[in-house]
């Protein structure tokens, strides 16, 4: 008995040949012996089985003796035998009908779990092998799972079925609900405009949640939410901002916010959420904002950092073209009666600059200009 | 057991549409096709059509451009309606159940009927 | 459609009698006949089913043969709950059609 592998929703031709290259009479039966179709000299003629407005023939091909039964938008309880007589001949053909669903939805949260499901006709013992975009491999029966689904996941996933030495394969796209970024870090000079961009890591036709920016200071004892907003179809719009700081919201996609200064009292770590509808869960992003101030009073040069910074930063200070008159693993730095000139207060990460700020020290009898 | 009972108004003015329901009780309606024939008075048996809950549904040819069937899983009923009618259309109404297994293909279960009257 | 054509269309016959029904179809419908009783008043009940079998619960006096386009429906000893009148209705090709009806009489 020949067997046929088909997938739930897809069409299937199963084929039927007789010896005599032309049109004779045929029919196809299921396992119950119910006539699902045949032909009556030129026509097709249907019987009552469940098949019936789902199954068709190709007349064009009668004359060369091929009698095909296709199935279209099979269903797993189209798995039976399928029986061909023709020229007083039986063909058997056992169609297995499988599906793969993933589980709910195909659009999840990061960190969330992906579940796959087979659907298999009774009496079946199917393999499942699944690929996954970044090329994981994971095996089953009638389950797969994958927790903790990372960005990378992203992507078709291409699931191989086996059964009686012949396999089906399924595509499944599966998008990771996520932002690019887990986390970022601004750098900036006290009193520069910030900005603080958040892309998302998919697209999807309508997009609609709501998202809260949530914000520790360094300096401050408690958390504060800085804005809420409301997310529609891409279109943002803010629906409670603080006044100190007073920020702004981009009305577009990728969601983007403007702190008018950079100050000391607003450098810290913030985490921004967003709620997406007829979704359990929600997408994060945190971000760091460094602010960076170089001051010279009386005799003093100093330059400080705010915000979270890792210990293997360093702080130095430096007149322009010179070494550096010192350089510390430290959040503060500052030289006693500094020479007149160009200074630079740099941050930097294994000698990559991270922020600068340029303090000119005019010779003692003036008072020092910013740039 | 599987029974049916049929119900609707018994008359309905010409070139109106007729609505009659089968209520399936003592199973259930899924997995099975669920047809209605008419037997006008003295007269022989007319398949009108059948309806399952996964497929869709087949009508008779001649009646066809007239012909709406549905189901309702909820209640377990379905139903049928007949656009346009005229004194043609007059007869006593049966809803039955169509039963597949090996080697047999036949209205296992049927309901008593209801009469169903074209007149102004 | 196929056409499904009765013989006779009403017959006479007495408690005791053997009767024979015959059903004759358009085009070669195979086995895929069904032979129904319908007495006044009431629904339709299957006797007959695949042309040649007997429904659960329906007595042996009640016999159908036949392939292709000739089928015959035969009561070995009448009774008297029998009197009514018997189709014949074809499942090989949709629409399903029934035959016009035999009337059974008391003699």
């Known amino acids: 008995k020949k067997v046929v592998l088909g997938k739930k929703g897809d069409t299937v031709e199963l084929t039927c040949t007789a010896s005599q290259k032309k049109s004779i009479q045929f029919h196809w039966k299921n396992s119950n012996q119910i006539k699902i179709l045949g032909n009556q000299g030129s026509f097709l003629t249907k019987g009552p089985s469940k098949l019936n407005d789902r199954a068709d023939s190709r007349r064009s091909l009668w004359d060369q003796g091929n009698f095909p039964l296709i199935i279209k938008n099979l269903k797993i309880e189209d798995s039976d035998t399928y029986i061909c007589e023709v020229e007083d001949q039986k063909e058997e053909v056992q169609l297995l009908v499988f599906g793969l669903t993933a589980n709910s939805d195909t659009h999840l949260l990061q960190g969330q779990s992906l579940t796959l499901t087979l659907e298999s006709p009774p009496g079946s013992s199917p393999s499942v092998q699944c690929r996954s975009p970044r090329g994981k491999n994971i095996q089953g029966g009638k389950t797969l799972s994958v927790s903790q689904l990372e960005l990378q996941d992203s992507g078709t996933w291409t699931c191989t079925v086996l059964q009686n030495q012949k396999k089906v394969e399924f595509k499944i796209d599966i998008v990771v609900l996520a932002f690019q970024k887990a986390s970022s870090i601004v750098y900036k000079k006290e009193g520069e405009q910030v900005e603080f961009s958040f892309p998302l890591a998919f697209t999807v036709e309508k997009l609609t949640g709501s998202g809260e920016l949530w914000w520790q200071a360094e300096r401050a004892s408690s958390s504060k939410s800085w804005i809420t907003f409301d997310l529609k179809n891409k279109e943002v719009s803010v629906k409670r901002v603080t006044q100190d700081p007073k920020l702004q919201m981009g009305k577009k996609l990728p969601l983007h916010l403007t702190l008018p200064q950079a100050l000391p009292q607003y450098a810290g770590s913030g985490n921004l959420t967003l709620a997406l509808e007829a979704k359990t869960g929600k997408l994060h992003q945190e971000v760091n904002l460094v602010v960076m101030r170089a001051t010279q009073l009386q005799k003093n040069l100093t330059c400080e950092v705010w915000g979270p910074t890792s210990p293997k930063l360093m702080l130095s200070l430096k007149l322009e073209n010179k070494e550096a008159k010192v350089s510390k693993r430290e959040k503060a730095v500052w030289v006693l009666n500094p020479e007149a000139g160009m200074w630079q207060c740099l941050l930097s990460d294994s000698g990559q600059v991270l922020l600068e700020s340029n303090i000119k020290v005019l010779p003692t009898w003036s008072t020092p200009v910013q740039p | 057991q599987v029974q049916l009972q049929e119900s609707g108004p018994g008359l309905v003015k010409p070139s109106e549409t007729l609505s009659l329901t089968c209520t399936v009780s003592g199973g259930s309606i899924s997995r099975y096709y669920w047809s209605w024939i008419r037997q006008p008075a003295g007269k022989g048996l007319e398949w009108i059509g059948r309806i399952c809950t996964s497929e869709n549904p087949n009508y008779n040819p001649a009646l066809k451009s007239r012909v709406t069937m549905s189901v309702d899983t909820s209640k377990n009923q379905f139903s049928l309606k007949l656009s346009s009618v005229t004194a043609a259309d007059t007869a006593v109404y049966y809803c039955a159940r169509e039963l597949e297994r090996l080697n047999y293909y036949g209205m296992d279960v049927w309901g008593q009927g209801t009469t169903v009257t074209v007149s102004s | 459609d196929i056409q499904m054509t009765q013989f006779p269309s009403s017959l006479s016959a007495s408690v005791g009698d053997r009767v024979t029904i015959t059903c004759q179809a358009s085009q070669d419908i195979s086995n895929y006949l069904n032979w129904y009783q319908q007495k006044p008043g009431k629904a339709p009940k299957l006797l007959i089913y695949?042309?040649?079998n007997l429904e659960s619960g329906v007595p042996s006096r009640f016999s159908g043969r036949g392939s292709g386009t000739d089928f015959t429906f035969t009561i070995s000893s009448l009774q008297p709950e029998d009197f009514a009148t018997f189709y014949c209705q074809q499942y090989d090709t949709l629409p399903i059609t029934f035959g016009q009806g035999t009337r059974l009489e008391i003699k």
């Open positions: 695949d042309a040649s």
